[in-house]
């Protein structure tokens, strides 16, 4: 058995185990350097146990500290295309709402790669709401295997 | 103490504490695109843990969500050597087996790097078996501490 | 809830929990190539539950697999700046004490790029020391959302 | 099989260059850099330096300050070495060959031989 | 640039007996886990033969009396059991950092 009988009886979500894992639906409008997410068994391999999509950003439902990973691959995309602009392309994840808890989490630049891929433990509150920000000219891979962005609740 | 009385008197992997970090062993013959994996404590830091290997490719024993990562560094490798080709040096993880789940779970492109490293979060079945597959003509380095596979179980 | 009541009696770090987030405070002088980390909620979302610093490096507290996960970003980097040294700036993650177990776990080589950012699971011990070391003439980002390195115990 | 087949024998005047060509069989050719190592009478090897024919880069020993270049043309399949300057101690078998699918200087295929003396 | 230094210079042995040539690099050749460290073949008249790559990796059709090892700067071929048609030059070569060098080459005779 994976469980003590005690925690068999109890919903899996109120053992803290709160868990989603994203992929791209679709970028935003010009103006708006937001990635937007879909999940779910549906879609594939992506699914939400706990946490929730408003408008395709991530909700966490419930407090503690987690482990945020993402990647993200820009598509028909060689080391030329990252390297040759004054700004290169970066990709931030960060609290964005509630506008008081606003703030950036974790922050990479393409450079001469195309691909970006990393992790890190934060602190999240209930409600607050991950924005992945994408700044630049060229479009991210919707392949699966390629961009995704996740979450897993490891302590309070 | 780490765990209450109860849970002491489990097995460890009767918890759901499936987890393994792999070293390279070898790669396969040049039609093979496969990297082949080992672990255990006699060699070094790496341990298996509930999951096995079968010919140097791990098969998960548990179902659940669990964390993939992988690193991965090319031997004598320079920015030239990796971007000069018009088909990238990639590294693929996928479940190989049973054919029926036969899917990519994670995909990078080394460009102007000479290491890929990145993580996610997947559902995986009793039975699966995960593949690596480095396509292009360098050589993955053997080094412990630049080249290593792991997974673990995160959630039912 | 989100423990059991027999569990929410214990301490968590009783659990197993131990876990810390850490950023960077400074790089030591020209003869010592490890980073310096500093973590605490007076400093933003850093913490530590169970680990400990010792004049700025990590000190592990409860024997046990632990992920250790880092990301660093080169200060005022371009590529040119990365690839332009014969020796590549590199940075390597290993336990420094005690002597008797010193090791690399973990290396990555900047090349082109100006982040590295990677993570793997790893036995660690009471007592291991652990130092992650910056060779080369860049300097690493101090932002908080740039560069940073973590533990998380995961299994005993 | 691959197969790298070599021009033939040539007699050069000190002073003048030569051009030695190597054609590759199968379609993979822009894909692996292509070596040139050549072997004086009764002495060892010696690297000459590679080209890799996708985009014309190259990489020389330095023993030979310039005097050689490397040239590719892909629609053809044929690596060309080119040496300038020739003296007496230029006389030597002249080799290109090529690792078998890494991108590693070690060599799998070899042409077999171009012989080139150097004789006033 | 590393050199490569081959002993002995000539080698005579007997049919059937081992045979054993030693190559020694000025400095390392091995890195992330390999030995860039190759052995060659030659006849007269004929190029290089490829018989080991990476220290001790038996290339396809080479027969398995042709054994190679060691690491670092220290590296050996051997012939288990001599054969007449093994008489020919031996090369060491490394590719660990350009430009690969070779060794002077050990004439391998019949005793």
């Known amino acids: 058995q994976r469980l003590s009988r005690a925690q068999q009886q109890l919903p899996l979500e109120s053992l803290g185990w709160d868990i989603a894992e994203l992929q791209l639906n679709h970028t935003g409008p010009q103006q708006d350097p937001r990635l937007y997410w879909q999940g779910g068994p549906a879609l594939g391999r992506s699914f939400l146990h706990g946490p929730e999509l408003d408008k395709g950003q991530l909700r966490i439902r419930r407090d503690g500290i987690y482990m945020v990973h993402i990647q993200v691959t820009l598509a028909i995309c060689s080391s030329t295309s990252t390297s040759r602009h004054h700004h290169p392309t970066t990709l931030a994840v960060g609290i964005c709402s509630p506008a008081s808890r606003s703030i950036s989490l974790l922050r990479l630049s393409f450079h001469q790669g195309c691909t970006i891929a990393s992790q890190r433990l934060t602190p999240l509150a209930r409600g607050d709401t991950l924005c992945t920000n994408l700044t630049g000219t060229l479009l991210p891979s919707r392949n699966t295997d390629e961009t995704f962005f996740g979450v897993q609740w490891v302590r309070p | 103490q780490r765990l209450s009385r109860a849970q002491q008197q489990l097995p460890l992997e009767s918890l759901g504490w499936d987890i393994a970090e792999l070293q390279l062993n070898h790669t396969g013959p040049q039609q093979d695109p496969r990297l082949y994996w080992q672990g255990g404590p006699a060699l070094g830091r790496s341990f298996l843990h509930g999951p096995e290997l079968d010919k140097g490719q791990l098969r998960i024993r548990r179902d659940g969500i669990y964390m993939v990562h992988i690193q991965v560094t090319l031997a004598i490798c320079s920015s030239t050597s990796t971007s000069r080709h018009h088909h990238p040096t990639t590294l693929a993880v996928g479940i190989c087996s049973p054919a029926s789940r036969s899917i990519s779970l994670l995909r990078l492109s080394f460009h102007q790097g000479c290491t890929i490293a990145s993580q996610r979060l997947t559902p995986l079945a009793r039975g699966d078996t995960l593949c690596t597959n480095l396509t292009g003509t360098l050589l993955p380095s053997r080094n412990t501490d630049e080249t290593f596979f792991g997974v673990q179980w995160v959630r039912p | 809830q989100r423990l059991s009541r027999a569990q929410q009696q214990l301490p968590l770090e009783s659990l197993g929990w131990d876990i810390a987030e850490l950023q960077l405070n400074h790089t030591g002088p020209q003869q010592d190539p490890r980073l310096y980390w500093q973590g605490g909620p007076a400093l933003g979302r850093s913490f530590l539950h169970g680990p400990e610093l010792d004049k700025g490096q990590l000190r592990i507290r409860r024997d046990g697999i632990y992920m250790v996960h880092i990301q660093v970003t080169l200060a005022i980097c371009s590529s040119t700046s990365t690839s332009r040294h014969h020796h590549p700036t590199t940075l390597a993650v290993g336990i420094c004490s005690p002597a008797s177990r010193s090791i690399s776990l973990l290396r990555l080589s900047f090349h082109q790029g100006c982040t590295i950012a990677s993570q793997r699971l790893t036995p660690l011990a009471r007592g291991d020391t652990l130092c992650t070391n910056l060779t080369g003439t860049l300097l690493p980002s101090r932002n908080t959302d740039e560069t940073f390195f973590g533990v998380q115990w995961v299994r005993p | 099989e691959v197969q790298l087949v070599q021009s033939g024998a040539e007699v050069k005047k000190p002073g003048s260059s030569v051009k030695v060509s190597c054609k590759a069989s199968?379609?993979?050719?822009?894909?692996?850099?292509m070596h040139w190592v050549r072997q004086a009478p009764g002495q060892g090897l010696e690297w000459m330096g590679a080209?890799?024919?996708?985009?014309?880069?190259?990489s020389y020993n330095q023993n030979f300050k310039g005097r050689v270049t490397l040239t590719a043309d892909k629609s053809t399949s044929t690596a060309y070495m080119e040496l300038s300057s020739l003296r007496s101690e230029d006389t030597a078998v002249y080799y290109c060959?090529?690792?078998?699918?890494?991108?590693?200087?070690?060599?799998?295929?070899w042409g077999q031989g171009t012989l080139v003396t150097v004789s006033s | 640039d590393i050199v490569m230094t081959q002993s002995p210079d000539s080698l005579a042995v007997s049919l059937g007996e081992r045979a054993t040539i030693n190559c020694r690099a000025s400095?390392?050749?091995?890195?992330?886990?390999?030995?860039?460290m190759h052995w060659y073949q030659q006849k007269p008249g004929q190029p290089p033969k490829l018989l080991i790559s990476?220290?001790?990796n038996l290339e396809s059709g080479v027969p398995d009396r042709f054994s190679g090892s060691g690491s670092g700067t220290d590296f050996t071929l051997t012939i288990s059991s001599l054969q007449a048609e093994d008489v020919a030059v031996y090369y060491c070569?490394?590719?660990?950092?350009?430009?690969?060098?070779f060794g002077q080459g050990t004439k391998l005779e019949i005793k």
């Open positions: 199968g379609d993979t050719f822009p894909r692996y850099n």
């Open positions: 070569q490394h590719s660990r950092e350009f430009p690969p060098t």
């Open positions: 400095k390392s050749v091995s890195s992330s886990g390999y030995s860039f």
């Open positions: 060959a090529r690792n078998s699918y890494y991108d590693y200087a070690w060599f799998t295929y």
């Open positions: 990476l220290a001790d």
């Open positions: 080209i890799f024919p996708g985009t014309g880069e190259t």
